[in-house]
Amino acid sequence: MHVAQPAVVLASSRGVASFVCEYGSSGNAAEVRVTVLRQAGSQMTEVCAATYTVEDELAFLDDSTCTGTSSGNKVNLTIQGLRAMDTGLYICKVELMYPPPYYVGMGNGTQIYVIDPEPCPDSD
């Protein structure tokens, strides 16, 4: 299953990055799981994940790091609390969980650049 996501996203000065993860038509998929993975070298670590259903048409990622909404076969993901050290490749993984058959797809990743804000100089 094809999964598309933007190649590059620049986080805001507040450490928030948003991007859309779009997957090939879900057909009759009623339950979809979306996972954001961070790739560092050969290592993959899970940043956050959520399962949502077509009946709800809206997903909330019950996680301190991510929030998101879904509409059809698009998921709007927002990752919060990012710092410069979190700059890296973030991969969107989509699993069509139910009903069978099971499908899984992974995007090529979104390179998220995070620049820590300059500290404000003390004012006399």
Partner: antibody, heavy 116, light 112 residues
């Protein structure tokens, strides 16, 4: 408003054929699987199978493989149940139902009577 | 195939009294994703079934909180805390975890 309206029920002689229809409205038809459920007089519910409305691929319960065929007309948002070589024991109310992770919407049911 | 066995076949309850229906599956109905697609439906004479509970314990919208579902693995229960006249009918459990999906045989609830 989401609706499933069924039609096509009839009195048929043994060995005959019949096609039942289930017309959906109020939602995107190809987003949800459609199921058929049978209920013989005074009996319980029996799952017949489902069809993926996006791919058109049907799945049948063992008791309904061979003489029963599910099909679609996506342009008309309609699901069909073709029944062949009908027997007295096929006499029942047939329901269509939309499934996601449950069945919130059902047709009103349509009755097939097989008798000579 | 997964056989869904409901007990009792029928029960007669006075209004305001509790009622409980059991549903046992012949094998675990935990789906590969960890969810259990076990539902409860109520069918009244001449009507289509109506969804009450999904995924074992989730009440469908509009269903009174008198209805509750519980269980895991192979044993499931539907409870009605205080039966009302409108609750009469046949209750069916259903498993949507393993194809072929299957209904229980039904439990008829009547009021005394």
């Amino acid at each position: 408003e989401i609706q499933l309206v069924q039609s096509g029920g009839d009195l048929v002689k043994p060995g005959g054929s019949l096609r039942l229809s289930c017309k959906a409205s109020g939602y995107t038809f190809t987003n949800y699987g459609m199921n058929w459920v049978r209920q013989a007089p005074g009996k319980g519910l029996q799952w017949m199978g489902w069809i993926n409305t996006y791919t058109g691929e049907p799945t049948y319960a063992d008791d309904f493989k061979g003489r029963f065929t599910f099909s679609l007309d996506n342009a008309k948002n309609t699901l069909y149940l073709q029944m062949n070589s009908l027997r007295a024991e096929d006499t029942a109310v047939y329901f269509c139902a939309r499934r996601s992770i449950y069945y919130p919407y059902w047709g009103q049911g349509t009755t097939l009577t097989v008798s000579s | 195939d997964v056989l869904m066995t409901q007990t009792p076949l029928s029960l007669s309850v006075s209004p305001g009294e509790p009622a409980s229906i059991s549903c046992r599956s012949s094998q675990s109905i935990v789906y590969s994703n960890g969810n259990t697609y076990l539902e409860w439906y109520l069918q009244k004479p001449g009507q289509s079934p109506k969804l009450l509970i999904y995924k074992v314990s989730n009440r469908f919208s509009g269903v009174p909180d008198r209805f509750s579902g519980s269980g895991s693995g192979t044993d499931f229960t539907l409870r009605i805390s205080r039966v009302e006249a409108d609750d009469a009918g046949v209750y069916y459990c259903f498993q949507g975890s393993h194809v072929p999906w299957t209904f229980g045989g039904g439990t008829k609830l009547e009021l005394k």
